[in-house]
């Protein structure tokens, strides 16, 4: 059982990376002198209480920044937010903290991240780029939900 977060870097199929801008994650083309975020991820330790066939339930944070991704409703719309939170505090909770959990599914080199709190909603970036990460349930051309996750050892 791994109980320290793993680190990874993420880009989408258009080779855009995640960058932190004013406490918001945006996807931008990789350039010189740019510092993409390093992702911290750790599997939920209560996997036996979560659905088995949707992927590996993980907490997703920004390495070294005490910020974690979470899903919350604004009005009727599930939204993706960054919250100040220690990923290990979430990991150690006595129950899964669903608002901070994502089902991580891998198909070949592609990864998707589905909200546990809002099944059917996925982390996505607009195909236009330079836009904040969002949650979407429309897995079409307007948004990219497939990401390349490279683990850093």
């Amino acid at each position: 059982k791994i109980d320290t977060p793993q680190r990874g870097s993420i880009q989408d199929i258009n080779h855009r990376v995640w960058v932190l801008q004013d406490q918001t994650l945006i996807a931008v083309p990789r350039k010189d002198r740019m510092s993409p975020v390093t992702i911290a991820l750790i599997s939920c330790r209560h996997v036996e209480t979560l659905e088995k066939d949707r992927g590996n339930p993980i907490y997703l944070g920004l390495n070294g920044l005490n910020l974690c991704l979470m899903c919350a409703k604004v009005g009727d719309q599930p939204t993706l937010q960054l919250k100040e939170k220690d990923i290990m505090d979430l990991y150690n909770q006595p129950e899964p903290v669903k608002s901070f959990l994502f089902y991580h599914s891998q198909s070949g080199r592609n990864s998707t991240f589905e909200s546990v709190a809002f099944p059917g909603w996925f982390i996505a970036v607009s195909s236009e780029g330079g836009c904040p990460l969002i949650l979407t349930q429309e897995l079409g051309k307007a948004n990219t939900t497939d990401f390349g996750l490279t683990m850093l050892f």
């Epitope: 209560h46 505090d89 150690n92 909770q93 006595p94 129950e95 903290v97 669903k98």
Partner: antibody
Framework: EVQLQQSGAELVKPGASVKLSCTAS????????IYWVKQRPEQGLEWIGR????????RYDPKFQGKATMTADTSSNTAYLQLSSLTSEDTAVYYC??????????????WGQGTTLTVSS | QAVVTQESALTTSPGETVTLTCRSS?????????ANWVQEKPDHLFTGLIG???NRAPGVPARFSGSLIGDKAALTITGAQTEDEAIYFC?????????FGGGTKLTVL
């Protein structure tokens, strides 16, 4: 207003089964965890277990495995506790409670009013 | 299975500070036990006070605080009020199951 409304008192015979209900209003049970707790006269509380109504997955205290069965129906926003092979030891008040995460911790934030179960011939 | 022990009864006076404790038969209580504290008033009225050892539930008055004191979890009421007369239960997590204590009957005279 958030409320957990439990079914009324039950008087049942030894060996029988009973199904208690806990109906939520003001929130959706699939967005939280529902816990069941037993309180015998002049005794403390005992954790029976919990259900995640979103997926039906349960956890039981080993002591109640085989005795208690927790289920939930999200369409009626109701959680259920079934108790089988009843004996006088099952005479107690049974509570449902919401176990909710706020900000940094889980809390028991809302409780039902309790259902009194009396097992007697 | 672990046994969680609390004082059976305590008495305090209005305005005084009182501390209730919660001991584990398995050894020292730690933050990994995620102590919860619950108040029971007459007519089966339960209120969650503390979660995660020391985090006050939303809406709970600031006079209630949770902590670890020595090898036990503790609930401190700073400036007790007559309406704090109740039974207080602690609950500790052990891996994937929860164990409640027997409760402390607090009298505020």
């Amino acid at each position: 207003e958030v409320q957990l409304q439990q079914s009324g008192a039950e008087l049942v015979k030894p060996g029988a089964s009973v199904k208690l209900s806990c109906t939520a209003s003001g929130f959706n049970i699939k967005d939280t965890y529902i816990y069941w707790v037993k309180q015998r006269p002049e005794q403390g509380l005992e954790w029976i277990g919990r259900i995640d109504p979103a997926n039906g997955y349960t956890r039981y205290d080993p002591k109640f495995q085989g005795k208690a069965t927790m289920t939930a129906d999200t369409s009626s926003n109701t959680a259920y506790l079934q108790l089988s092979s009843l004996t006088s030891e099952d005479t107690a008040v049974y509570y449902c409670a919401r176990y909710e995460y706020y900000d940094s911790s889980f809390y028991f934030d809302y409780w039902g009013q309790g259902t009194t179960l009396t097992v007697s011939s | 299975q672990a046994v969680v022990t609390q004082e059976s009864a305590l008495t305090t006076s209005p305005g005084e500070t009182v501390t209730l404790t919660c001991r584990s038969s398995t050894g020292a209580v730690t933050t990994s036990n995620y102590a919860n504290w619950v108040q029971e008033k007459p007519d089966h009225l339960f209120t969650g006070l503390i979660g995660g050892t020391n985090n006050r539930a939303p809406g709970v008055p600031a006079r209630f605080s949770g902590s670890l004191i020595g090898d036990k979890a503790a609930l401190t009421i700073t400036g007790a009020q007559t309406e704090d007369e109740a039974i207080y239960f602690c609950a500790l997590w052990y891996s994937n199951h929860l164990v409640f204590g027997g409760g402390t009957k607090l009298t505020v005279l």
